[in-house]
């Protein structure tokens, strides 16, 4: 029987900069029941606080609700593991909420085949940013990535769309049914999950473009 091993806070995420959650990995348990507590202070403070919510984020987590979350202050936190034989502490972790945003997937992905008379046909898609993200503040720039593949293909083809919320793809295989998805990330945050797949049937008379270009 031994004191617990050193835990590690390995992940912090915020869906929208208004709340966030951090997760830790326990070290070895030393063969005894182990209690974990997360304590933190914010920059400029010396007063230590205990995690306000150990439940919402699931096991080995700490959730900071709206009243505990500030975008203007860096959080300094550590986890303490204690059993009957002693304690161990994680390394201190510094968290700036701006840099841990992982948004929900983009919404309302629509995909259409456009066949203008005077130009080659193309696949046109548009989407909306996730509702929880407030883009009006200006500091929040979302970047988008699209992926698509024929229904039975193994490999995805990905396209970076930058800040655009619509996109054209010129090179597709006629007669195939395609799956299309989109995801987003803030410029210094994390990619969202992919949106639910949207299916589109490419007509058999769709003319393949000579060059594999995509246009914003």
């Amino acid at each position: 029987q031994l004191p617990p091993g050193k835990p590690e806070i390995f992940k912090c995420r915020s869906p929208n900069k208004e709340t966030f959650t951090c997760w830790w990995r326990p070290g070895t348990d030393g063969g005894l029941p182990t209690n974990y507590s997360l304590t933190y202070h914010r920059e400029g403070e010396t007063l230590m606080h205990e995690c306000p919510d150990y439940i919402t984020g699931g096991p080995n987590s700490c959730h900071f609700g709206k009243q505990y979350t500030s975008m203007w202050r860096t959080y300094v936190m550590m986890v303490n593991a204690t059993n009957q034989m002693g304690s161990s502490f994680s390394d201190e972790l510094y968290v700036d909420v701006t840099y841990i945003v992982q948004p929900d997937p983009p919404l309302e992905l629509t995909v259409e085949v456009k066949q203008p008379e005077d130009r080659k046909p193309y696949l046109w898609m548009k989407w909306s940013p996730p509702t929880l993200i407030d883009l009006k503040t200006g500091w929040f720039t979302l970047l988008y990535e699209i992926r698509l593949k024929p229904e039975k293909a193994a490999e995805w083809e990905t396209h970076f769309a930058g800040q655009q919320t619509e996109f054209k793809i010129l090179s597709l295989h006629p007669g195939q049914k395609y799956l299309v998805q989109v995801r987003c990330k803030p410029d210094h945050g994390y990619w969202s999950a992919w949106s639910p797949a949207t299916f589109i049937q490419i007509p058999s008379d769709f003319i393949m473009n000579d060059h594999h270009h995509h246009h914003h």
């Epitope: 590690e8 390995f10 990995r25 920059e43 975008m71 203007w72 840099y99 500091w139 994390y190």
Partner: antibody
Framework: EVQLVQSGAEVKKPGSSVKVSCKAS????????IHWVRQAPGQGLEWMGE????????NYNQKFKGRVTITADKSTSTAYMELSSLRSEDTAVYYC???????????WGQGTLVTVSS | DVVMTQTPLSLSVTPGQPASISCRSS???????????LHWYLQKPGQSPQLLIY???NRFSGVPDRFSGSGSGTDFTLKISRVEAEDVGVYFC?????????FGGGTKVEIK
């Protein structure tokens, strides 16, 4: 203990490429961005770019765009910085550095001296 | 790119005396999220840089309280209240509000 251990010194010819490695230990490699910063002899520090090892997303200093490639190998917890079309002005110590969930550099590698000389 | 200008270029200080380093940026370092990402690093002779102060005025873990940072907008200062022999090296200010991140040219501090 968090450690960033870099590869050894290199001497390169003008026009060639160099690839510097940075092996991370003591933490979960995919959790934090790795940055590359260089320092020419007797000079200041210059940020080259960064990578998120969890998905290999990169941002580069436009000054180096097209010449620098930053990659990460999750299986070995190692980040790499490759600089191509080397010239004498690229002679410098190249550092990798790690952030927290922040945008400042809390941990630094020991540096790798790259000398470009004909 | 944001240009960071440090003064003085070098500083010779008697142990126990104060020291002050100035850093000026070519544009405001207030991020659109309200934070000011101005940091100070020390590079001791033959070593890699180490973080001293983050976000203008916050001491990093293990940094002695004789180091303090202040300033806002474009003008920032690092103060050492009583210089010790182990404080010798080159001090760099750095901004990470705007990409690319940039550094000042450095201030060399030596002991008289």
């Amino acid at each position: 203990e968090v450690q960033l251990v870099q590869s050894g010194a290199e001497v390169k010819k003008p026009g060639s490429s160099v690839k510097v490695s940075c092996k991370a230990s003591g933490y979960t490699f995919t959790s934090y961005w790795i940055h590359w910063v260089r320092q020419a002899p007797g000079q200041g520090l210059e940020w080259m770019g960064e990578i998120d090892p969890s998905d290999s997303y990169t941002n580069y200093n436009q000054k180096f765009k097209g010449r620098v490639t930053i990659t990460a190998d999750k299986s070995t917890s190692t980040a790499y910085m490759e600089l191509s079309s080397l010239r004498s002005e690229d002679t410098a110590v190249y550092y990798c550095a790690r952030s927290f969930f922040t945008n400042w550099f809390a941990y630094w590698g020991q540096g790798t001296l790259v000398t470009v000389s004909s | 790119d944001v240009v960071m200008t440090q003064t003085p270029l070098s500083l010779s200080v008697t142990p126990g005396q104060p020291a002050s380093i100035s850093c000026r940026s070519s544009q405001s370092l207030v991020h659109s999220n309200g934070n000011t990402y101005l940091h100070w690093y020390l590079q001791k002779p033959g070593q890699s840089p180490q973080l001293l102060i983050y976000k203008v005025s916050n001491r990093f873990s293990g940094v002695p309280d004789r180091f303090s940072g202040s300033g806002s907008g474009t003008d920032f200062t690092l103060k050492i209240s009583r210089v010790e022999a182990e404080d010798v090296g080159v001090y760099f200010c750095s901004q990470s509000t705007h990409v690319p991140f940039t550094f000042g040219g450095g201030t060399k501090v030596e002991i008289k």
